[in-house]
Structures are given as structure tokens and as C-alpha cells.
Interface confidence: medium
Amino acid sequence: HNTTVFQGVAGQSLQVSCPYDSMKHWGRRKAWCRQLGEKGPCQRVVSTHNLWLLSFLRRWNGSTAITDDTLGGTLTITLRNLQPHDAGLYQCQSLHGSEADTLRKVLVEVLADPLDHRDAGDLWFPGESESFEDAHVEHSISRSLLEGEIPFPPTS
């Protein structure tokens, strides 16, 4: 799976979209999970309504919401009041039985609020040393990772 980078500004909302084949994934609930390290498990953050027919209803877990357009085939995740610790690697998932298919791998980058001068840095990355390949970007703000670019720079 390619990785799509979504950039948001600290303190603001970030909307992540995950398109999918609505016929292939018909009847399946969806989920948004956070990758714990490149090879680690994906920890569930929020999932769509328990009744698939009600997947269009927005469900919240803390500051993260999820809603699913099951006819159009678009899963939408909203990260409200984006914070530096929200930066990291996530997955949109399609659930079937005890298994989950990855719909999209997402790298969330948090940009500093340009009106907030308390921090000199302008971009927060997850504190991981691992890298991953085949990343590309959609603007939300979003961009493509260049070939060989490391989304998780080594921590000093």
C-alpha cells in the first residue's frame, strides 16, 4: 500500500478521506487505527456504527470522528483540534469478521499554527526511527513523499 500524507495545522481540524470500492466492501464496517511503529500493531481509534446501514452517522472517540459514505465509497475521518501528538502513521480499514483490510495508509503531519510564535519548529513528526516506502500524497493540505524520503526521521 502506498502512503498518503495529510497535513493539518495545530489547533485546527484535519479531514482525512479514504476512497474505496463500494461494491467490494459492501456490508463492511470501517475503522481508523494508529500504527504503533512500522511493524507494530494498528491500534483502533474509532470505528463506524455497529449497524452498517447507519455508517453515515458520525461517531466520535475523543477528538476523532469517523463517517462512511457507503454508496459513494468514501470513508472520512476528522481530527479536531489537531495537536503535535496526533502526528503519525494511521490506517483506514475495512472490517470483515476478525480480519481487517487496509484501505489506505495515512501519514498525518502537524504544522505549527502560523499565529503561534511560542514554538520555533514548523512541523512535528512522529518520534519513530523506522522508515517506509511507496508514499504519495493528497492535498488536504497534503503532498507526495519523495522517493527515499523518510517520514520518521531519526530521533537524536
Epitope: M23, G27, R28, L53, H96
Partner: antibody
């Protein structure tokens, strides 16, 4: 109307590869999961695996996974089964079937089946 | 894998009889989306299986009303309210809640 037709050799030698094709007509081929199922003579049904023609995604029965490949040719409305290193235990009637057309509350059952083709593994 | 167990493995009945076949799964068949993907198929000798009931209790198109399905969780039943001559066949339950899909061993309904 919806039709599925299996084709392929009826006799395969032990240790060789069994190859079957299912040709589909009468509906939007790329939007339903397609399955292979087999039935040894006088026995029950065994699911082999499935493929989604839209993107080629596959799932296999773990008991056969190391020997099975299911592929699709959307230009011909066909999907294929290859089963390697066959033995007499692979002698069966092989069926192709689609999952019930994806409509609200109606998915995940096999509504249309091919008539089946008997494959005998023997030297 | 989910194991499907049918009972009885065979039965003899007469035209007009009420016939009940049971199917038990080794784990719950409730999918994460709330649906239960338990289906029933009918197969006659030399023919491909035909879908009778999908998702526990929904009759497939063209299936006579004498066929009905019920159950939940792990225990399911197929009932033929009044057996007809064309109903003598083998019946299979099947689950598609989880891959790999699995079938029961079949119940053969024979003429008494």
C-alpha cells in the same frame, strides 16, 4: 441472464497442476466476488478461494493456500483456478460461483453457480 | 476456521411431512456489521448447489414459501413445512461471515 461456465481438462496427472477457467456472462462481472468450490465424489462442499475482479484481491482456504492461485482476466470476463502438485485427493467436481450481487443486506451468499466440471487426478 | 455441523446427516420422510434440519457453528456467525451470514443450499445428484436461504431467514428469489430459516448466533434451523417430491435432495448450511467460507457436511433427505 447470469451464466457461469467452467472449462478445463478432466484428467490431470499426479504432481501436475490443475487449471480451470470460469467464463461469466449476464451481469457486471467486476463488481461481485467470484469463488471456486469443489466437491469430491460422494462428499461435501469445500470452499477453495475467491477473487474480486475489480482489483484482483484474493482470499484462499488456508488448507490449500500453498498450492492455489486464482486470477482474473476482466477483458474476457473469465477467472481461473490453478492448483499445483495435485494428488488423488484433489479429484472432485469443481464449481465456480459468484457471491450474491452486492445490494443492501443481500451480500455474501453464492447465488449463481456453474454446472461444475469433474477433474480426475490419475496417472 | 469455523466448523459447521449439521444434524441429522440423513433422514427419511414422506411427502407432506414437516422436516427440520439443524446447523451449529463452532463460533458466532454475527459479522462485525451486525449481519449473520448463514445460508442454506439445496443440491440434487449431478447438479450444482442452489441457494435457498441467505442470511439466516431470507428466501432467495423463486424459492417456495414452504422453505424457511431461523436461528441466531451459533444455532440455526432449516424447515420445510410440507415436503414435496422435488424437495428430496441434500441440504447444506454454509457460513460466509469469516474467510475461509465453510459448509456443513450435508443432510440427505430421502423418501420414506
Amino acid at each position: 441472464q447470469v451464466q457461469l461456465q467452467e472449462s478445463g481438462p478432466g484428467l490431470v496427472k499426479p504432481s501436475e497442476t490443475l487449471s480451470l477457467t470460469c467464463t461469466v456472462s449476464g451481469y457486471a462481472f467486476s463488481s461481485s466476488w467470484m469463488n471456486w468450490i469443489r466437491q469430491p465424489p460422494g462428499k461435501g462442499l469445500e470452499w477453495i478461494g475467491r477473487i474480486y475482479p475489480g482489483d484482483g484481491d484474493t482470499n484462499y482456504n488456508p488448507s490449500l493456500k500453498s498450492r492455489v492461485t486464482i486470477s482474473v482476466d476482466t477483458s474476457k470476463n473469465q477467472f481461473s483456478l490453478k492448483l499445483s502438485s495435485v494428488t488423488a485427493a484433489d479429484t472432485a467436481v469443481y464449481y465456480c460461483a459468484r457471491l450474491l450481487r452486492n445490494q443492501p443486506g443481500e451480500s455474501y451468499a453464492m447465488d449463481y453457480w456453474g454446472q461444475g466440471t469433474l477433474v480426475t487426478v490419475s496417472s | 476456521d469455523i466448523q459447521m455441523t449439521q444434524s441429522p446427516s440423513s433422514l427419511s420422510a414422506s411427502v407432506g411431512d414437516r422436516v427440520t434440519i439443524t446447523c451449529r457453528s463452532s463460533q458466532s456467525l454475527v459479522h462485525s456489521n451486525g449481519y449473520t451470514y448463514l445460508h442454506w443450499y439445496q443440491q440434487k445428484p449431478g447438479k450444482a448447489p442452489k441457494l435457498l436461504i441467505y442470511k439466516v431467514s431470507n428466501r432467495f428469489s423463486g424459492v417456495p414459501s414452504r422453505f424457511s430459516g431461523s436461528g441466531s448466533g451459533t444455532d440455526f434451523t432449516l424447515t420445510i413445512s410440507s415436503l414435496q417430491p422435488e424437495d428430496f435432495a441434500t441440504y447444506y448450511c454454509s457460513q460466509s461471515t469469516r474467510v475461509p467460507y465453510t459448509f456443513g457436511q450435508g443432510t440427505k433427505v430421502e423418501i420414506k
